[in-house]
Interface confidence: low
Amino acid sequence: PKQTLPKPIIRAESTYMVPKEKQATLCCQGSYGAVEYQLHFEGSLFAVERPKPPERINGVKFHIPDMNSRKAGRYSCIYRVGELWSERSDLLDLVVTEMYDTPTLSVHPGPEVTSGEKVTFYCRLDTATSMFLLLKEGRSRDVQRSYGKVQAEFPMGPVTTAHRGSYRCFGSYNNYAWSFPSEPVKLLVTGDIENTSLAPTDPTFPDSWDTCLLTRETGLQKDLALWDHTAQN
């Protein structure tokens, strides 16, 4: 069997949801000594980065300027050490946002409910779309989908205090082209026992864990600080 290196990890810096015309940054974390990293888009070669010095860098950043719907889709990366190529990374879905209209998000029976109550979010968007997405801030990978023409429902069922937090919705023109985000709606769920004066902590939106964490070898120790490698060809 043909020998391959372990697959790299591909991540989006800051977020995989990139406003149109803004720059997207994807990180490919491979291995020290990798001489070349390739970014693939929808199965085809999209960009190449060659770190210098390769033995002291375990990944690269790919900057994708002027985000638009043609650049939104599925990305993956591979790397090479000598003549040996790695397996392909997992796929990363890069989404362009701020396309066309802005939806309106509402919640019923209201933003303040008691644990156990049934709650439904409604996302309304004027522009033609068939899919709507509801995201809880800080959990942007946990996307709920619903279908409708101008408005979609997101029944949450009986809620618990775990549902507390801020929500936004998007209309999706295709899997990778989303509308502007709605204004956030904060859901407050009061419990029977716990201290309800403690407001839930809302992680910043988008997720903090989407950050690229590339490491640089400095002798025996690795510098775990964020490090922006601008590749030179």
């Epitope: 701020e98 209209d101 802005t102 004027d126 522009t127 033609a128 023409k149 023109y173 204004e183």
Partner: antibody, heavy 116, light 107 residues
Framework: QVQLVQSGAEVKKPGSSVKVSCKAS????????MHWVRQAPGQGLEWMGG????????SYNQKFKGRVTITADKSTSTAYMELSSLRSEDTAVYYC?????????WGQGTTVTVSS | EIVMTQSPATLSVSPGERATLSCRAS??????LHWYQQKPGQAPRLLIK???QSISGIPARFSGSGSGTDFTLTISSLEPEDFAVYYC?????????FGQGTKLEIK
């Protein structure tokens, strides 16, 4: 009831700018996008662009991009359309229209005449 | 952009008769097609949304049909106040586009 009331007729010189207002009432202004459609004398309807008052997101017809600016003031429920570098062919009736999927409510129209 | 083509440009029909107006999109717009009526000196008025959905306050004699690229507005029995210009509109994708209009005149 929903009402869109536009500012009055304007006469402008070529090369100048015009700003037309559209005051909305009878509904929650931020819940619908507001668009501008124009109609030259004896001609059909032409979409210029729209705005989401929610956060100011805009979409423009490329034909007008760079010349048209659409804004909205949530505090007064008023949308504005400014068209710059006016030329004689911009002589038209300009309508604001609320969009709820379709253009379900329209302003009465503002006549803009461009003449030297 | 999606080009909307209406036919005929002018339609002459007698009051009490049936009028059929056509609209064709240059590519499929599903049922995201809206119809408007405009009388001289007035703003357009929404008649039908999403190809066939009726609008509150619009007489039942106005109906719409079609999906994809071909659409029809039917006025079952023309009243004198129905003589006007009718426009179809692509509501599917930006830029939003209108047909050039069909003028419905008294025969």
């Amino acid at each position: 009831q929903v009402q869109l009331v536009q500012s009055g007729a304007e006469v402008k010189k070529p090369g100048s700018s015009v700003k037309v207002s559209c005051k909305a009432s009878g509904y929650t202004f931020s819940e619908y996008t507001m668009h501008w459609v124009r109609q030259a004398p004896g001609q059909g309807l032409e979409w210029m662009g729209g705005i989401s008052p929610n956060i100011g997101g805009t979409s423009y017809n490329q034909k007008f991009k760079g010349r048209v600016t659409i804004t909205a003031d949530k505090s007064t429920s008023t949308a504005y359309m400014e068209l710059s570098s006016l030329r004689s062919e911009d002589t038209a009736v300009y309508y604001c229209a609320r969009r709820g999927g379709s253009f379900d409510y329209w302003g009465q129209g503002t006549t803009v005449t461009v003449s030297s | 952009e999606i080009v909307m083509t209406q036919s005929p440009a002018t339609l002459s029909v007698s009051p009490g008769e049936r009028a059929t107006l056509s609209c064709r999109a240059s590519q499929s717009i599903s049922d995201y097609l809206h119809w408007y009526q405009q009388k001289p000196g007035q703003a357009p008025r929404l008649l039908i949304k999403y190809a066939s959905q009726s609008i509150s306050g619009i007489p039942a004699r106005f109906s719409g049909s079609g999906s994809g690229t071909d659409f029809t507005l039917t006025i079952s029995s023309l009243e004198p106040e129905d003589f006007a210009v009718y426009y179809c509109q692509n509501g599917h994708s930006f830029p939003l586009t209108f047909g050039q209009g069909t003028k419905l005149e008294i025969k």
